[in-house]
Structures are given as structure tokens and as C-alpha cells.
Interface confidence: low
Amino acid sequence: GMEVRWCATSDPEQHKCGNMSEAFREAGIQPSLLCVRGTSADHCVQLIAAQEADAITLDGGAIYEAGKEHGLKPVVGEVYDQEVGTSYYAVAVVRRSSHVTIDTLKGVKSCHTGINRTVGWNVPVGYLVESGRLSVMGCDVLKAVSDYFGGSCVPGAGETSYSESLCRLCRGDSSGEGVCDKSPLERYYDYSGAFRCLAEGAGDVAFVKHSTVLENTDGKTLPSWGQALLSQDFELLCRDGSRADVTEWRQCHLARVPAHAVVVRADTDGGLIFRLLNEGQRLFSHEGSSFQMFSSEAYGQKDLLFKDSTSELVPIATQTYEAWLGHEYLHAMKGLLCDPNRLPPYLRWCVLSTPEIQKCGDMAVAFRRQRLKPEIQCVSAKSPQHCMERIQAEQVDAVTLSGEDIYTAGKTYGLVPAAGEHYAPEDSSNSYYVVAVVRRDSSHAFTLDELRGKRSCHAGFGSPAGWDVPVGALIQRGFIRPKDCDVLTAVSEFFNASCVPVNNPKNYPSSLCALCVGDEQGRNKCVGNSQERYYGYRGAFRCLVENAGDVAFVRHTTVFDNTNGHNSEPWAAELRSEDYELLCPNGARAEVSQFAACNLAQIPPHAVMVRPDTNIFTVYGLLDKAQDLFGDDHNKNGFKMFDSSNYHGQDLLFKDATVRAVPVGEKTTYRGWLGLDYVAALEGMSSQQC
């Protein structure tokens, strides 16, 4: 007959489960409830996945693991005696008098409820990792946290390798016993203890529950340490960098923490499980009943099968672990869950040329010498597309790609960004803009709407800022109208003449090479490499400077890189940035410094792309630790990550312009990373490639 096999994780829980089974049987509740003994919640999840058990109640972190790794789904939720229903909130509390924000937590002293506790550890640490504020190398979260904060009290961290830092603020009991114990012996343990750690000035931030401050201030009946405390002297840190009153926890928190829930296999009828438990709670949740579902007192433990504070069980409508956990908690868990035993020992980097192989080999050696994890291995491929294929096929793990290639990697191969490049320090959005540069000329001034018949300079055919975006934008705006998808002819007819260097000039309209000049000897005209002096962003700007063209489509940094003494080549040495302007989409002209408001599109920086099952936080964690050692082009550690001059190449592994590798933050998909305008431009262009 039909039966539900509950998984118990301990002898007391098995005892209570047996009693529940008997009570249900006696009451005629169907289907039958049987009990299976597991050794832990993790083991029970495996038993359920293997169809050797059917159900267990789990906390949020375990629900995430069970859902993500084993396909289990939550079907029944616990509700507790509090106003927020099936959840509570994890908050970060600071003293009102301090100036700490979520963005300035590095180096501050932190108070935690306990190691691996939900609001005191899992949510804040996971959130800091997931948002890119805290980088973790080789899954060593404890080391990362101990390096990040300026000392902490994390009760239970005394047995770890980082107890010096993680237990530095702990004080034990009044006689100094039990320092850093995960028990009430440690005065800074649990919600009230972590808040006390903040209130007494030991720490600068406390990671606690939304109700903690209000329960421990304003003259509530409390131990002496809290009697004089006022809730108005504390504030919450919000995710957007602001702060808020402690009563504003619904709007200002790190994450909504889901209640515990009963999980089952995807093929199990959730309605059946709820009907079984609902019958049970109807009969066995009131005091004095022969069996009490929501009490564990009789077994000498707490929270057996269900949390003792459960007031009722409710059916879960959307039975997916993502929906139950909510995006805030889900994101935090993504940042936290990193199993060192499942971390591959190597990160296989895709390389595309001999110089790149050489630089990658040096990078692997340099990283290994510094004991950075995972170790780099270099695997060669024929092209970026070949890299994508090899990554999808799990033969390689990572490659740095440009915007267009990111689009292909995401759309066609399912890859995701793990880290990004960050270029100019003033470029706060970590990306650059496509701009149309013209000479400042009051007598012959023209606008973007008047480009027809002008002479144009482009970095090269297929170059993002030099071709794809400007041409895409002009097509989108209806200025260029390709017939039969023939973009090249349409562009050649739109401009009077152009220089658009190209690698394969077969069937290439001659006017697209008309302005090109080739090398010093006049050879290699219009070739798609630096032998053509008007090739690349610098070359396209030179084409404008030397009056070959009227407009140059370049990056927003190109003018600054080649004027005001920044480029000593003869053609650029005397140039001044004030002599150039930008054409804006609204028909105006603007100073070259106004690129953020006057551009054709924002192009994302290059990103490191990986398979979706790769832990992006370990990739960023490796790169972040590496750049501390090798990121500065003047470092003395034997390798320069963001410089290719030693290898007679340019932009090897990373663009040479990279200042830092940055976390992807919320831009965890190729579309998120690329941005809507840029994707639209690419899709506009690709719609013409018939």
C-alpha cells in the first residue's frame, strides 16, 4: 500500500518519528507514516533522492542544497508565532554614531551569532561573497572572512585554523571560561550575544535577526548589560549602501530567511504530504494531546522533525526551492556554498596563440608558487568559438571574451560570466562607451542625423565600437537601410568614403577602403591589423586627426589616450582633447568628457566566461588574490597579469588596459553582463546577417 517514509537524523528524532507514526496510525491517518534512520540531514537528502526515503524538514541552506544538487522540492512550510509568517529577516546592525555602511565593512570588527548559523554567518558571508565584496579563494571561506574583518567573535570558530582572528572579540563567561564556545558560556553567543558584542563596543557590526535589537533594548526585562540600551542608538545597514532605523527591517535587510520546509522528490505529490501532515497537526498540535508534533521536550532535545516554535504547517504553492527560498536568500547561498572536496584542482584556461600560451604558462607557474587555488592549466584552441565549444564540452573551463563573443558564448553555448575586466578607474560602471568623434568645427558642424555623405573612420570590420554598434545604431535609427541584408553595400553607399580595415576583402566594397593608408611604404592598405595605420581605435582616431575622415567611431577613452601628451607618436604628440567633440543620439554635440550622456551604446568590458556549473566565486576568488600579487604592472612578484609586453603581444589572456578583475555581482548571465542596449545592437546586426 501507499506509505510516506520520513527520514530521521538522530535517535531522539527516530523515537519521536516512531511515536508520530503510531499516533497517526491510531487516528486512522492515511497514508501510513514510516520512519527511516539517516545519519544526518545531508544523508537523508541522499536517501530521498535514491528513493529510499520520502520526506524530511530542512532549513534554508539544506533546502538549497537538496533542490540544486538532488532535485528535491519544498511542499509544506512551517509558520512561526511571529508577524512575518513563513520567514524572518537577517539584518546587519551598527551603532548610530558610527559611519559604517555595507560598502565599508572591510576591516571593521564583526559580531556573529555563531559559526554556520543562518543569520549570523551563512546569510551575511554568502551575501558579501555573492555581491563581490568578499572574495574567496579555493573555497576557504573561513580564511576569507578572517582576512576581511578586522577581528570577529564567531562562536564555534575556536576549532578552526583562523581562531585568532575569528575569536578575537569573544570573551567567554564572567570568569573567562568558554571563550568562543558555540554555547551560552560565551557571552557573545546567539542573537542577543552578538548584539551585546556590538552594544558593548567590542564590535562595529552585528549580524542578527530583525527582532533582536527591539527585544534587547528600551528597558525590556533584560540582564544588566542591556537595561540602558535604546533602540534609537542603532541602525540597520541596507544592501544599497544606505542605513535605516531598526524598525525598517522589511525594507532594509540582507535577506529574507525562509522558514524550514518539508522537502520531497520532484515526483512526489506535495498535496498528499500536506494532507497527511495537516490531518496530523489538526489532531496533534494542541497541548495535552497524546502526541505533540511541535514539541520535543519529551525526547530531551529541541526541534525534532519540526521546529518547536512552529504554530502551523502550510502548503507551499510554488513547489520549487528557488521560489520558497526567495532571490535574496538564494543569492546568499550561492555565495556561501563551496565544497573544497568538489573543487576541481585545476582551472583550465583557453589560450589562442603562441604568445598567449607563453603568458599562460608563466601565469600558471606564478600562481602555483604563491599557492593560489585552483591551479591554472593552459589549453589551446583555434578561435574564441572553439574555446566556447571546448568549455561546453568540459574540456576547458574558462576564457576571457569580448562583448560579441560573450553574446555567442551565452546564447549558443550556455556559458556565464564569472569575473569581468575593469578598465579606467573613473569608469564606475566597468564598461566603455561607443562614441562618434568629430573635429570641433563651428563652420562645418554636422550632427548624427547628418552623417550621410560624410567620410567615416572605423577601427575595423566587426570591431564592436568601430563597426557593430555604430552600424547597428544607424540601422536601428533607420538611417542605413540594407537591401537584401547587404549591410556592407548599404554602409558603403551611406558614407562618401570610409576606412574599415578587414581581414578578408573578398567582395568588399572599395569605398570601405578608400580612406585607408596602409603602412609607411603604402603597402597592406586596409588590412585588418596594425600594418594599416588607420586600424584599431587609435588608427580610426588618427584617420580623423589627419583629416582623412569626418567622423571616427571609437571608444570613449580613445580621445584621452591619444591627446594631451598621452601618445608621443608624431601624429598625436601635439593633439588636444578640446579640439574634438562627440555626436549625440539626440542630435546635439558634446564635449568629449560627456561620453556617459552622449554615446551610441555602452559596451561591456571583457569577461571571463565559464560553464554554468562552474563556481564563479572560486574563479573570481582566484583572480582577486592573484591580482593583489600580480595585478599592478609595476609589481616585483615575477609576473604581470594585465601586461603583455614581455610576450611581444597585446591583450593576452586579459586586455592590457585592465586595472582590476571585478566580480560580476548581479550580472550573472550573458544578457545581464552585456546590457540591453548592446544586446539589442548585436541582435539588430545579426538580424541583417542573412
Epitope: 544538487e69 532535485g71 520532484a266 515526483d267 568538489r342 576541481p344 584542482p345 564540452a393 550556455g414 554554468p612
Partner: antibody, heavy 119, light 112 residues
Framework: EVQLQESGPSLVKPSQTLSLTCSVT??????GYWNWIRKFPGNKLEYM?????????YYNPSLKSRISITRDTSKNQAYLQLNFVTAEDTATYNC?????????????WGQGTSVTVSS | DFVMTQTPLSLPVSLGDQASISCRAS???????????LHWYLQKPGQSPKLLIY???NRFSGVPDRFSGSGSGTDFTLKISRVEAEDLGVYFC?????????FGGGTKLEIK
């Protein structure tokens, strides 16, 4: 219990397109990997490709230019299309599930459907 | 592709005997993560293939303990300690360490 059932025409003419359906019960097609394998006369098995829970596809490079695997989540079905078939494509076609629980071994298979390519 | 060679092609046995099937890979099946993704399947006459063993030696749920898998690197063995009538059919080994997954040519277990 998880069950997979392949269906489609048993006879396809050369140069035409072979289209098969894999209907899944007892599991959702939005979890795990759903694969197509074919068995040639004489027992040789060839892995053709998969569609994953997130809709990503992988195709055996030997078939890449001809194969397409799609799905309809509302019907809980996966589909195989093989273009420009020849007599060499005569085989029994199976769909199978792979999940993490068995480290992506194929834990459940359909009965298979026999397809002959002939004019 | 990675070639999987199974021997013997045909294995005549008496009921109650031990049977042993060998599978050899053209290259090591040890993944960079340390795991070896070598699996065994049985296809009984007129039935769909069934998973017996995954990752070299793990029995799939419901598979009798008379079936055992062993091996490492490139050489693997499936043993049936006491052959029963319901064990007859074609046994396949398969690897999924390397992409695409590949299969052995099959071993037909039949009654002497």
C-alpha cells in the same frame, strides 16, 4: 516511477528528416538531462546528444550539422530531429535520463523505437 | 572519440556460474576531478537498457548484490557472482568522463 516512451515514424525516406518524440512521465523534463542514443544493427550504440533542464543542448560532433534536440515543457516531451538521413541512420532510437544522483549515468531509458531509412 | 573495447563478444555460462566481462578504454577514464565515470548497462531481450552500476562500482537502486564492478584507469570488470536466468542479455559498458559519452560493443551473456 520514471518512464520514457519514444514515438515517431518507423520508416523514413533518404534525404528526409527523422523526427522522434520522447514522452516523460514520473519526472519533469525541467530537471536532469534528456538524451538520445541510437543502437545500430549489430549492437553498436552511439550517443547523439542531450537537452538539459535549462534548455541547453549538446550534440555529438559527428552529427552536429544534422541534429536538433528540443523540448516542450508543457507537454513534458523532448524531441529529436535528424536531417538529411541516409541508410546509415537505420537504427533503434532511445531516449534516456541522466541525473546527478547517479553521476550522470543514464538511469532510465525508453523502450526504443526502430527506424528504417529506405526509399 | 574515446574507444571502449568489450571482451568477450559472447559469454556462454551455466546458471550458478560466475561471469566476468571486461571493458578497456583507449585512454584513462579518470576525470580531472578524481572521479571515474564508467557505467554498466544490461539490455535484456525485448526490453530497454537498464543501469546496473555507475561510477565503476556503485550499484543502482534495485540491482542485486551479485553484480559488482571494479577497475581503474583504462581497465574495468563487471562480475556476476552466481548467474541467474534473468541475467541473460547484452551487457554494455559506457564512459562519460570524456565528451561525447561512448559505449562498448556489448557482451552477450547466454546459456551454454
Amino acid at each position: 516511477e520514471v518512464q520514457l516512451q519514444e514515438s515517431g515514424p518507423s520508416l523514413v525516406k533518404p534525404s528526409q528528416t527523422l523526427s522522434l518524440t520522447c514522452s516523460v512521465t514520473g519526472d519533469s523534463i525541467t530537471s536532469g538531462y534528456w538524451n538520445w542514443i541510437r543502437k545500430f544493427p549489430g549492437n553498436k550504440l552511439e550517443y547523439m546528444g542531450y537537452i538539459s533542464d535549462s534548455g541547453i543542448t549538446y550534440y555529438n560532433p559527428s552529427l552536429k550539422s544534422r541534429i536538433s534536440i528540443t523540448r516542450d515543457t508543457s507537454k513534458n516531451q523532448a524531441y529529436l530531429q535528424l536531417n538529411f538521413v541516409t541508410a546509415e541512420d537505420t537504427a533503434t532510437y532511445n531516449c534516456a535520463r541522466r541525473t546527478l544522483a547517479t553521476y550522470y549515468a543514464m538511469d532510465y531509458w525508453g523502450q526504443g523505437t526502430s527506424v528504417t531509412v529506405s526509399s | 572519440d574515446f574507444v571502449m573495447t568489450q571482451t568477450p563478444l559472447s559469454l556462454p555460462v551455466s546458471l550458478g556460474d560466475q561471469a566476468s566481462i571486461s571493458c578497456r578504454a583507449s585512454q584513462s577514464l579518470v576525470h580531472s576531478n578524481g572521479n571515474t565515470y564508467l557505467h554498466w548497462y544490461l539490455q535484456k531481450p525485448g526490453q530497454s537498457p537498464k543501469l546496473l552500476i555507475y561510477r565503476v562500482s556503485n550499484r543502482f537502486s534495485g540491482v542485486p548484490d551479485r553484480f559488482s564492478g571494479s577497475g581503474s584507469g583504462t581497465d574495468f570488470t563487471l562480475k556476476i557472482s552466481r548467474v541467474e536466468a534473468e541475467d541473460l542479455g547484452v551487457y554494455f559498458c559506457s564512459q562519460s568522463t570524456h565528451v561525447p559519452p561512448t559505449f562498448g560493443g556489448g557482451t552477450k551473456l547466454e546459456i551454454k
